[in-house]
Amino acid sequence: GDLLIQKTIKKQVVLEEGTIAFKNWVKTGTEVYRQFWIFDVQNPQEVMMNSSNIQVKQRGPYTYRVRFLAKENVTQDAEDNTVSFLQPNGAIFEPSLSVGTEADNFTVLNLAVAAASHIYQNQFVQMILNSLINKSKSSMFQVRTLRELLWGYRDPFLSLVPYPVTTTVGLFYPYNNTADGVYKVFNGKDNISKVAIIDTYKGKRNLSYWESHCDMINGTDAASFPPFVEKSQVLQFFSSDICRSIYAVFESDVNLKGIPVYRFVLPSKAFASPVENPDNYCFCTEKIISKNCTSYGVLDISKCKEGRPVYISLPHFLYASPDVSEPIDGLNPNEEEHRTYLDIEPITGFTLQFAKRLQVNLLVKPSEKIQVLKNLKRNYIVPILWLNETGTIGDEKANMFRSQVTGKIN
């Protein structure tokens, strides 16, 4: 009996036309939502003038439906048993699941000012930037609508730069009508233990953002894993959002709509400093902000973001070192709300429920030559927003799963 089930599972999880896995893989049957909480700065004047702690108040959720588009350019390669595809991006605002509208205003760090002052450190260039910042009446902080902040706005300061630069700024700009990839993943035809594991991303086996093993593209995209998952496994996956591969470990058994699943979580060790977790040495890319690689819980992804000083963390700086959150008031990290987890059905390896949580932060540094930054006495890793991307298997699909998979085994 068990052998027959194993054989059936192996057949059905292959990523090729006609299998259950393929149908759900091309276009997810699960509704996926991305909730945003924006950190509204309460004391912009005090920060800019006196280098005070930044007082933030989160506002949200503002919810978008995402991942509703089918994979594009799906191409099987029989020679190396891979399938390649693009994952199109799309986001639709869901007013009924949101606390306000896309026109809501927020006081946030001026993204262009923070980024430009970081990218162009030459003193003479900074003097020019200063005059353009002042001329455009730009400041350290700005008021932007949710739509502008997420999806892009024309920046008045960048619009004055006398040589060609992208004048549109947004945390997720460009997003709609773009695609992530090309991904090339193993389809599992020759070896089921490799199914969904990424072979190449954008034509490469490495990212070119990190040194050594940190630069590797490991595992799947976390939507599924090879079948027959064991609790002892460390599940590796790659996330283009954070420009790195990461891993999850077993935490507990969970019952999801009558289906036994394994809850895997991202452990705090994955965010630790090299002092505590030597494997993380290659995620420490500079010595000053990281305090000689002793800070933890924030990931400098500037190399992946054209030099813009973007730092990724868990929401509210969960699992981050005290020095990171010390200059920010109003954060309340807690594991239940702010950690990432994957609920995996162990027989098929399918992720039936997940919550991916991350926070986008921007570094801003004092600058003698830029007036709106010259009163700062310290560096700040400024939280801009955090997001919670969730998906849960629908009731209908769960029934089908119970009858066809778990029901047959028990």
């Epitope: 004047q45 009446k137 350290m140 902080f141």
Partner: nanobody, 126 residues
């Protein structure tokens, strides 16, 4: 003609009070953020207080916090600066300035301001 005019300056003893006015003509002040600056002899002009146009938010430099108060009377198209507990180091020429279109006024960058008054002298001396 667009104009800002300060008044109310003068000679006052340490510990005394003065109320400066900044009256606008040729434009409506309630659409503008208003800043007060001062320039002491031999020193650079410094921003001391402003009131934003959008939400009436105020900001005071540490040197005047708790002693000076800014307010606006839109009906009279005038902004006031009430100065209490004056000290000799408050001696300076006081200027008001108006900035349109900046709902995020978070500092005293002179280039932000579209219109300036001529200034009024404040002398604090016994």
């Amino acid at each position: 003609q667009v104009q800002l005019q300060e008044s109310g300056g003068g000679l006052v003893q340490p510990g005394g009070s003065l109320r400066l006015s900044c009256a606008a003509s040729g434009f409506t002040l309630d659409y503008y953020a208003i800043g007060w600056f001062r320039q002491a002899p031999g020193k650079e002009r410094e921003g001391i207080v402003y009131i934003s146009n959008s939400d009436g938010n105020t900001y005071y430099a540490d040197s005047v916090k708790g002693r000076f108060t800014i307010s606006r009377d839109n009906a009279k198209n005038t902004v006031y600066l009430q100065m209490n507990s004056l000290k000799p180091e408050d001696t300076a020429v006081y200027y008001c300035a108006a900035d349109q279109g900046s709902s995020v006024m978070h500092g005293f960058i002179e280039e932000w301001y579209d219109y300036w008054g001529q200034g009024t002298q404040v002398t604090v001396s016994s």
